[in-house]
């Protein structure tokens, strides 16, 4: 029961996390124009991983994609790569974890297989979450560096008159979505790994003991026979094949929700 809940919750948390990573990757507001202590402009600039946008005071918004690949900063390319790797790993992890869920019956899949799949998906979620956190953190570091560089340039003018006011950029909503989503995916992955330990059949329970019954003798090897008559069978593991809908084992799905600012 606790294992099923842990596994189910881990799956849901990871699902929300991966949805968040996808949303963050697609969002345009990775960096937004800093409005504090800046000459107030009638346009608002913000940038994403794939395009930059300008919103005029009328609400008119124009976005331009980064149509060059070689001309983009290496750091931006690295962030893109980290986010995509995170999404791909997360998606594979979700696919694997669906089949690994204890509450879902797929043929005569053994518990050991489910345990391995749960561990695999858990590791994938952990790596996915780390990729997202790393990607967002690299971008944030890039912003901080550029922010202070542009601040320094802002107050140094030629001949006492600044001809151009540099637009400074600060953290956008996508960064926070990415951090939270990466964290959730990481937590979900850890939960899956914890659930895996509970799923794994404990071999120490079944020693090689010879039972002398009247009439005939049956030797039980470690792990027991799955196709036995029921005597001494692993009822703990067998409960999964009941097929009946049991409310305590059902995984409640929480809707994925994230605000696009």
């Amino acid at each position: 029961m606790a294992v099923t809940a842990c596994q189910g919750l881990g799956f849901v948390v990871s699902l929300i996390g991966i949805a968040g990573i996808i949303a963050a990757t697609c969002m345009d507001q990775w960096s937004t124009q800093d409005l504090y202590n800046n000459p107030v402009t009638a346009v608002f600039n913000y940038q994403g991983l794939w395009r930059s946008c300008v919103r005029e005071s009328s609400g008119f918004t124009e976005c331009r994609g980064y149509f060059t690949l070689l001309g983009l900063p290496a750091m931006l390319q690295a962030v893109r790569a980290l986010m995509i790797v995170g999404i791909v790993l997360g998606a594979i992890g979700l696919l694997v974890s669906i089949f690994a869920l204890k509450c879902i019956r797929i043929g005569s899949m053994e518990d050991s297989a489910k345990a391995n799949m749960t561990l695999t998906s858990g590791i994938m979620f952990i790596v996915s979450g780390l990729c997202a956190i790393a990607g967002v953190s690299v971008f944030a570091n890039m912003l901080v560096t550029n922010f202070w560089m542009s601040t320094a340039n802002m107050y140094t003018g030629m001949g006492g008159m600044v001809q151009t006011v540099q637009t400074r950029y600060t953290f956008g909503a996508a960064l926070f979505v990415g951090w939270v989503a990466g964290g959730l995916t990481l937590i979900g992955g850890v939960m899956m790994c914890i659930a895996c330990r509970g799923l794994a059949p404990e071999e120490t329970n079944y020693k090689a003991v010879s039972y002398h019954a009247s009439g005939h003798s049956v030797a039980y090897k470690p792990g027991g026979f799955k196709a036995s008559t029921g005597f001494g069978s692993n009822t703990k593991n067998k409960k999964i094949y009941d097929g009946g809908a049991r409310t305590e084992d059902e995984v409640q799905s929480y809707p994925s929700k994230h605000d696009y600012v």
């Epitope: 009638a42 600039n45 940038q47 300008v54 009328s58 008119f60 124009e62 001809q163 151009t164």
Partner: antibody
Amino acid sequence: QVQLKQSGPELVRPGASVKLSCKTSGYIFTNYWIHWVKQRSGQGLEWVVRIYPGTGNTYYNEKFTGKATLTADKSSSTAYMQLSSLKYEDSAVYFCSREGYGKGNSMDYWGQGTSVTVSS
Amino acid sequence: DIVMTQSPSSLTVTAGEKVTMNCKSSQSLLNSANQKNYLTWYQQKPGQPPKLLFYWASTRESGVPDRFTGSGSGTDFTLTISSVQAEDLAVYHCQNAYYYPYTFGGGTKLEMK
């Protein structure tokens, strides 16, 4: 077609207040910024303030903070600008205008102007 | 505030002549993100409100004759009339549409000989 009709000329005493109106038609009033621009006789234009009727948000030229107060009546699609504590230098023609959508923050339609004369 | 300086303050021309007027801003009006200059040109005839001619420095408003051309970038902008007509006699204003508060130039008055 888009139209902005302003109230008639005003002759006021120094220290008094005046409320100018700008009635709009031909477009959705709540979706566009309304600006007010001052033009003193034979001089250039001076941006005073703008209001977004949909939300009531306003941006003032600091020079006119405390001098001008903006309001908008959605039901009649009319913008108002009240000028208080009038001085002789407030004598000017005041234009209301609409900020165009996707036109680089420019004002695409203008009212005919309201002449305000401050005289004792 | 951004200072907009227009030159000359007045121009006396003859019909059919090519006219150029300038507008200089104290700070760049170029937004690097979209490479657009937030400068607007207006035409104001006597007793009338201003009329929008150009936005983004060079984008002609609908209904404006193509003899009018807006150009320039950063801090220096130009309005050119290729062949002046009698109906073009007016005051031409440039406006900073990038920084608050919006500011206007002193205007260039176009007169006929």
